[in-house]
């Protein structure tokens, strides 16, 4: 069972001093990270017992395995059901505490009732403040039964539940008809899933015979020991004031466990600590009684004395629960209460015994859960004991359960049961996960979900090139860390598998499924340099570069050009996908911008060293387009162009550029500069007769501006073939400026 205890401080003079603490003895409990499982939860459960809302309760975590609930302001805050949840995965367990108001009309004689399947449970509500009205019993908040107030027996209302079954488990309450629910008596009924002394899926297995009020868990056959007792069968008492499965916890405060209620995982429920009893666990046991709730009687023999915490303290020469066994009777010594082995191992189990007459090899035997008896293969005889060694045949899962070492001599016999847990070595259910890759290394997350049992002690990563028959390389790693596989071949697929191990001999599990992980390409090593660049417009830049000459093939798939606009904090990346390219045209740049430029070779996803950077200033954008461009044929070889200056000029125009192109022609256009920017008219000469031409123009300040609209005009006919267009400018007269 999970080592989880819910402690309630029942010193109820002041609700503000009341607290609930949940303590986990589980390894790593409450840390809340994936490696350790979810944290402890401690809360009031208002689903069944609803109380008036009050200020929120305060939850305080004390270290990794303890959580405390405080902040109760009035007695009604305390009434109801509280639960603590701890443990991870399939071991996640809820421990429940039911708090009754000491001033209620009805009080439970006993809050927790643990019964076996098929038993009759009797819940008894004692009249504390009588009301002459019906008593309503509820189960998990729903109506269950009614008793007339005359049906009380000796001041108690009894609810008999014959032949109880596990679904009958839950919170029961007894309330006077018109009383507040806070005046109810609240009970917790726990119905084990099996009949008395049995456990397991079909209730076919026999419980170990839990001592000192321990309760056999119907799922795993373990004894849930009362607070203050430990051992497989709860045979051992803790020191006063200690609790937990290994007696590792200590009751807070100077008065030890006085005034504390302890709640443990089902099917135990709640009780006072060992040595205490009463509704508030503040009364010491009466003479001759001991244990949780003082439920146990000492009945010590042979001069033994009763200790209210541990039971009979035997004088020398005697042992046993009631000091009934003479030390002359053989006695099993120091037998571990629980042993753990891995599946299919063949462990050696030792069993030591002493007594008079002295036990010999043949007088000690080992009995498996299925009744098979093993005889020892060897015995070591020492002055004070004989240790028999048993070689156990290959373990199977059915060997899990309670084994027994038995010693028999003419002086009598003794036996000691101990639990053997056969664990299944872990087998990964999934392949390891690739985190990052380089050309010569892979970073892998090895810890995956697995079948079988933990904890994981070691993780082995096996790897080799895909389709290879060579031996697997193996690396042993810490379970919680990522692994770097190094010195690999670039651009190579590797088959990678995980093998998990748990502690102990034979704890290595089978290899998990393989996965293919491929190393990256080799990194390109050549550093290009920028040969030059020139501006082809306010937003266009042609760049050229070179690479050093090296023998062998070029390791690279292409080039990456980067332009950094420091003013705007923007980077432009241009991919040139040919490794043979040595020039590129960058378009769509921002005019008037200062760029830092570099180039680097890439291979797959890897970038080589960048070239030394160059700094490029693009000219600012030019002026707006000239307005109202108009063309007029003057002769068979001349056309006159007129226009208006652009508006909103950022500075003085340095020239105009006219573009001339034969309409429908396939050749390149001709650009003609008009170097006298003050003019608004020019004549284009040397044109062909009867030919249709297209004209557009733009102005230049520091850079070329936007093109004007395109105009069409045809030269007049019957002319001779001209050598080519030229121009003559003049300022337009007022009449031509139309």
């Amino acid at each position: 069972a999970v080592d989880l205890t819910l402690l309630a401080n029942l010193r109820l003079t002041d609700p503000q001093r009341f607290f609930l603490t949940c303590v986990s003895g589980e390894a790593g409990a409450g840390r809340g990270s994936d490696a350790w499982g979810p944290p402890l939860l401690l809360e009031k459960d208002d689903r069944i017992v609803r109380t008036p809302p009050g200020p929120p309760l305060r939850l305080a975590r004390n270290g990794s395995h303890q959580v405390t609930l405080r902040g109760f302001s009035k007695p009604s805050d305390l009434v109801g059901v509280f639960s603590c949840v701890g443990g991870a995965g399939a071991r996640r367990t809820r421990v429940i505490y039911v708090h009754n108001s000491p001033g209620a009309h009805l009080l439970p004689d006993k809050v927790t009732h643990t019964v076996n399947k098929g038993d009759t449970a009797v819940l008894s509500a004692r009249v504390h403040k009588e009301k002459q009205t019906d008593v309503i019993w509820k189960s998990n908040g729903s109506y269950f039964y009614t008793l007339d107030w005359h049906e009380a027996q000796d001041g108690r209302f009894l609810l008999q539940l014959p032949n109880v079954q596990p679904p009958s488990s839950g919170i029961y309450s007894a309330t006077y008809l018109e009383a507040s629910p806070l005046g109810s008596a609240f009970f917790r009924l726990i119905v084990r899933g099996c009949g008395a002394g049995r456990w397991g899926p079909g209730c076919t297995k026999e419980c170990p015979g839990c001592l000192h009020g321990g309760v056999c868990h119907d799922h795993d056959g373990e004894c849930v020991c009362p607070p203050g007792f430990t051992g497989t069968r709860c045979e051992q008492a803790c020191r006063e004031g200690r609790f937990g499965q290994s007696c590792q916890e200590q009751c807070p405060g100077i008065s030890g466990c006085r005034g504390l209620t302890f709640c443990l995982p089902d099917p135990y429920g709640c009780s006072c600590g060992s040595g205490w009893r009463g509704s508030q666990c503040q009364e010491a046991c009466a003479p001759g009684h001991f244990g949780a709730d003082c439920r146990l009687q000492c009945q010590c023999q042979n001069g033994g004395t009763c200790d209210r915490f541990s039971g009979c303290v035997c004088p020398s020469g005697w042992h046993g629960v009631h000091c009934e066994k003479s030390d002359r009777i053989p006695q099993i010594l120091n037998m571990a209460s629980e042993l753990e082995f891995n599946l299919e191992t063949m462990p050696r189990i030792n069993c030591a015994a002493a007594g008079n007459p002295f036990p010999v090899r043949g007088s000690i035997e080992l009995r498996k859960p299925d009744g098979t008896v093993l005889l020892s293969t060897k015995a070591i005889v020492e002055p004070e004991k004989t240790t028999a060694e048993f070689e156990v045949p290959r373990l199977v899962l059915a060997d899990s359960g309670f084994w027994e070492c038995r010693v028999s001599t003419s002086g009598g016999q003794d036996s000691r049961r101990f639990k053997v847990n056969v664990k299944v070595p872990p087998v990964p259910l999934a392949a390891p996960r690739l985190l990052t890759k380089q050309s010569r290394q892979l970073v892998v997350s090895p810890l995956v979900s697995f079948s079988g049992d933990g904890p994981i002690s070691t993780v082995r990563l096996h790897y080799r090139p895909q389709d290879s028959t060579m031996d697997w390389s193996t690396i042993v790693v810490d379970p919680s860390e990522n692994v770097t596989l190094m010195n690999l071949r670039p651009k190579t697929g590797y088959s990678v598998r995980v093998q998990l191990s748990r502690p102990g001999e034979g704890g290595e599990g089978a290899w998990g499924p393989p996965t293919l992980m491929t190393t990256d390409c080799p990194e390109p090593l050549l550093q290009p340099w920028l040969e030059g660049w020139h501006v082809e417009g306010t937003d266009r830049l042609r760049v050229s570069w070179s690479l050093p000459l090296v023998p062998g093939p070029l390791v690279g798939d292409g080039f990456l050009l980067r332009l950094w606009d420091g003013t705007r904090g923007q980077e432009r990346r241009e991919n040139v996908s040919s490794p043979q390219a040595r020039t590129a045209l960058l378009t769509g740049l921002t005019p008037g911008t200062h760029y830092q430029l570099d180039v680097q070779l890439y291979h797959c996803t890897l970038l080589g060293p960048a070239s030394p950077p160059a700094h490029v200033l693009l000219p600012p954008s030019g002026p707006p387009a000239p307005r109202h461009l108009h063309a007029q044929a003057l002769s068979d070889s001349e056309i006159q162009l007129t226009w208006k200056h652009p508006e909103a000029l950022p500075g003085p125009i340095s020239k105009y550029v006219v573009e001339v192109q034969v309409a429908g022609g396939a050749g390149d256009p001709l650009w003609i500069d008009v170097d006298r920017p003050e003019e608004t008219s020019t004549i284009i000469r040397g044109l062909n007769a009867s030919t249709r031409y297209l004209f557009r123009m733009r102005a230049s300040i520091q850079g070329l501006g936007d093109w004007s609209n395109t105009v069409e005009e045809s030269t007049l006919g019957n002319g001779l073939q001209a050598e080519g267009p030229v121009q003559e400018s003049r300022a337009a007269e007022e009449g031509l400026d139309q």
Partner: antibody
Framework: EVQLLESGGGLVQPGGSLRLSCAAS????????MYWVRQAPGKGLEWVSV????????YYADSVKGRFTISRDNSKNTLYLQMNSLRAEDTAVYYC???????????WGQGTLVTVSS | QSVLTQPASVSGSPGQSITISCTGT?????????ASWYQQRPGKSPKLLIY???DRPSGVSNRFSGSKSGNTASLIISGLQAEDEADYYC????????????FGGGTKLSVL
């Protein structure tokens, strides 16, 4: 579905006897308080008798005390009303009713008519 | 003679709201929060409408509501409908020894 079905009513002479039955189904009969309530023709409802789940506690209206006996057989899921020394004023429709978790009569039978007349 | 006092009849038009009162003593309605109301249509069994003063069972229209003040419980029917025409009875626990439960004399509701 909760159902209560009364039977056993009829015409009886003054001083005579009748035994009414109420067959219950659709719920755990053995857990509920059961009542007999009657309604004289054209009159209001009148509580007659009550029996608690165990059968250990029974109560009667003053008008029927000493003459009527309420009982139950939890194994048969049946409620009974033994009526002796019947009088003309006992003429009524007799209903059996279940007291629910709320304390009110949440289910009623269809009623059985008892006529006491010479 | 009924222990709880109800008006013999009330009437209302469709869509209106009406209230039926039920007056008891400090031994019944005044003491317990267990007043309940039942509707009985002609020739039918009573049907639970309201329990514990103001709670409605599932399936009962929210046009029916209940309240209590001192020794008097009230049934309020809002948005009166023709099918509401019936007899209405109140009931309560009583602490008088011989009485476990007491009923009102009933109120005939007519929908005009």
């Amino acid at each position: 579905e909760v159902q209560l079905l009364e039977s056993g009513g009829g015409l009886v002479q003054p001083g005579g006897s009748l035994r009414l039955s109420c067959a219950a189904s659709g719920f755990t009969f053995s857990r509920y308080v059961m009542y007999w309530v009657r309604q004289a023709p054209g009159k209001g409802l009148e509580w007659v008798s009550v029996i608690y789940p165990s059968g250990g506690a029974t109560y009667y209206a003053d008008s029927v005390k000493g003459r009527f006996t309420i009982s139950r057989d939890n194994s048969k899921n049946t409620l009974y009303l033994q009526m002796n020394s019947l009088r003309a004023e006992d003429t009524a429709v007799y209903y059996c009713a279940r007291r629910g978790s709320s304390g009110a009569f949440d289910y009623w039978g269809q009623g059985t008519l008892v006529t006491v007349s010479s | 003679q009924s222990v709880l006092t109800q008006p013999a009849s009330v009437s209302g038009s469709p869509g209106q709201s009406i209230t039926i009162s039920c007056t008891g003593t400090s031994s019944d309605i005044g003491r317990y929060n267990y007043a309940s109301w039942y509707q009985q249509r002609p020739g039918k069994s009573p049907k639970l409408l309201i329990y514990e003063v103001s709670d409605r069972p599932s399936g009962v229209s929210n046009r029916f509501s209940g309240s209590k003040s001192g020794n008097t419980a009230s049934l309020i029917i809002s948005g009166l409908q023709a099918e509401d025409e019936a007899d209405y009875y109140c009931s309560s626990y009583s602490s008088t020894n011989s009485l476990q439960v007491v009923f009102g004399g009933g109120t005939k509701l007519s929908v005009l």
